[in-house]
Interface confidence: medium
């Protein structure tokens, strides 16, 4: 062994995903999401599975409620460790409305631009996490069509927590979130009973995202 050899502590991805993907996670941060810690735990578990870097996978995060915020751009961080630190710091921005179409549309039009780090020829993946029917449902069909036209693969996650807590029917909500997912829906759509259960889908979601480059 060379005398200059050093042992360096680092976070190794749980499941190596060294493929090139540009992934934008679109998070519902409206008031009804609770507890927010469950969302950051989900992000942590998902992101630590990724090999993040300028030549590997890039991740950006957009949060929406009534308005949309770019939490960080695709090219903001160049390692998994940096992204994990940044994701833990994301605070819930709230909002009385769930503008899902606006969130997705902003991700498509802004987060996936070269100015924000998107790379030409690299597969685009969007992960949408929401807990309620959108207040801008009129635009949803159109916005999804626009994503389709730009070959953005979409994984959608329906959190049923607020519906279950209020003993409300989830049927219409689930149909809406299914409509967001790419085809085949059964491979791109997930639903969880509440926010705490988000972590239970990380392994399967991660495998399906990584399989896109296989």
């Amino acid at each position: 062994v060379s005398p200059t050899f050093q042992v360096v502590n680092s976070i190794a991805p749980v499941q190596e995903c060294s493929t090139q993907l540009d992934i934008v996670i679109v998070l519902d941060g409206s008031n009804s999401i609770y507890p927010w810690d469950s969302v950051t735990a989900f992000l942590n578990d998902l992101l630590e599975r990724m090999d993040i870097g300028p030549k590997q996978t890039q991740v950006g995060i957009v949060q929406y409620g009534e308005n949309v915020t770019h939490e960080f751009n695709l090219n903001k961080y160049s390692s998994t460790e940096e992204v994990l630190v940044a994701a833990k710091k994301i605070v819930q921005r709230g909002g009385r409305q769930t503008m899902t179409a606006l969130g997705i549309d902003t991700a498509r039009k802004e987060a996936f631009t070269e100015a924000r780090g998107a790379r030409r020829g690299v597969k685009k993946v969007m992960v949408i996490v929401t807990d309620g029917e959108s207040h801008d449902n009129h635009r949803l069909k159109k916005v999804i069509q626009d994503c389709e036209d730009e070959n953005i693969q979409r994984f959608s996650i329906a959190i049923l927590g607020s519906y279950n807590r209020g003993n409300l029917s989830t049927e219409k909500f689930v149909e809406e979130i299914k409509s967001i997912a790419s085809e085949p829906t059964e491979k791109h759509f997930f639903n969880v009973s509440d926010e705490l259960a988000l972590v239970t889908i990380v392994k399967t979601l991660g495998e399906r995202i990584f399989a896109l480059e296989a």
Partner: antibody, heavy 120, light 108 residues
């Protein structure tokens, strides 16, 4: 300049169908959704639905489901709206309208001159 | 369906005066999806304001929009002769898209 030019006035009998055309010029036809809005004499505005000129995909207001058909011919940059089983209360001016998506998030920025459809 | 109620039905004012038009929604509307249009007799409507407060291209700065949630306002700071017309509000976020019944601004 950017404009939408619609076909001329129509007079129809109850039960018949009407097909109104809308020719776009001055912009990329397939780049913007087109909506149809109607206005009964002396009344307000009523949204009928939209067509995506790029894919041909449509979304109709529930009130008009089963009676309205929106189509397009990209080779001549023209959209069409056909309303069937006409009734006297369908008498209205029909407008085709462009929805601007990039800046305006689909507000209606360009309107056709309108086509008067009379059912009697 | 979101119902938009405009008031007053008619506003009688003189040129140079300030006009304040109200649009109230039956449920909350995002600012991003609220527009105002002007329509003159025999003409198609014209977009004035989008996103509740942004002026469309070529619209004079005497027109301004404000509001959020369920209450929105269009203000014309100093009425010009060409401003006497009917004004409609519209929400274009929730399906079906809906318009208010209109406010007519007429010369006193």
């Amino acid at each position: 300049q950017v404009q939408l030019v619609q076909s001329g006035a129509e007079v129809k009998k109850p039960g018949a169908s009407v097909k109104v055309s809308c020719k776009a010029s001055g912009y990329t036809f397939t780049g913007y959704y087109l909506h149809w809005v109607r206005q009964a004499p002396g009344q307000g505005l009523e949204w009928m639905g939209w067509i995506n000129p790029n894919s041909g995909g449509t979304n109709y207001a529930q009130k008009f489901q089963g009676r309205v058909t929106m189509t397009r011919d990209t080779s001549i940059s023209t959209a069409y709206m056909e309303l069937s089983r006409l009734r006297s209360d369908d008498t209205a001016v029909c407008y085709c309208v462009r929805a601007e998506d990039q800046q305006l998030l689909d507000a209606f920025d360009i309107w056709g001159q309108g086509t008067m459809v009379t059912v009697s | 369906e979101i119902v938009l109620t405009q008031s007053p039905d008619t506003l009688s004012l003189s040129p140079g005066e300030r006009a304040t038009l109200s649009c109230r929604a039956s449920q909350s509307v995002s600012r991003s999806y609220l527009a105002w249009y002007q329509q003159k007799p025999g003409q198609a409507p014209r977009l004035l304001i989008y996103g509740a407060s942004s002026r469309a291209t070529g619209i004079p700065d005497r027109f301004s929009g404000s509001g959020s949630g369920t209450d929105f306002t269009l203000t014309i700071s100093r009425l010009e002769p060409e401003d006497f017309a009917v004004y409609f509000c519209q929400q274009y976020g929730s399906s079906p898209l809906t318009f208010g019944g209109g406010t007519k601004v007429e010369i006193k």
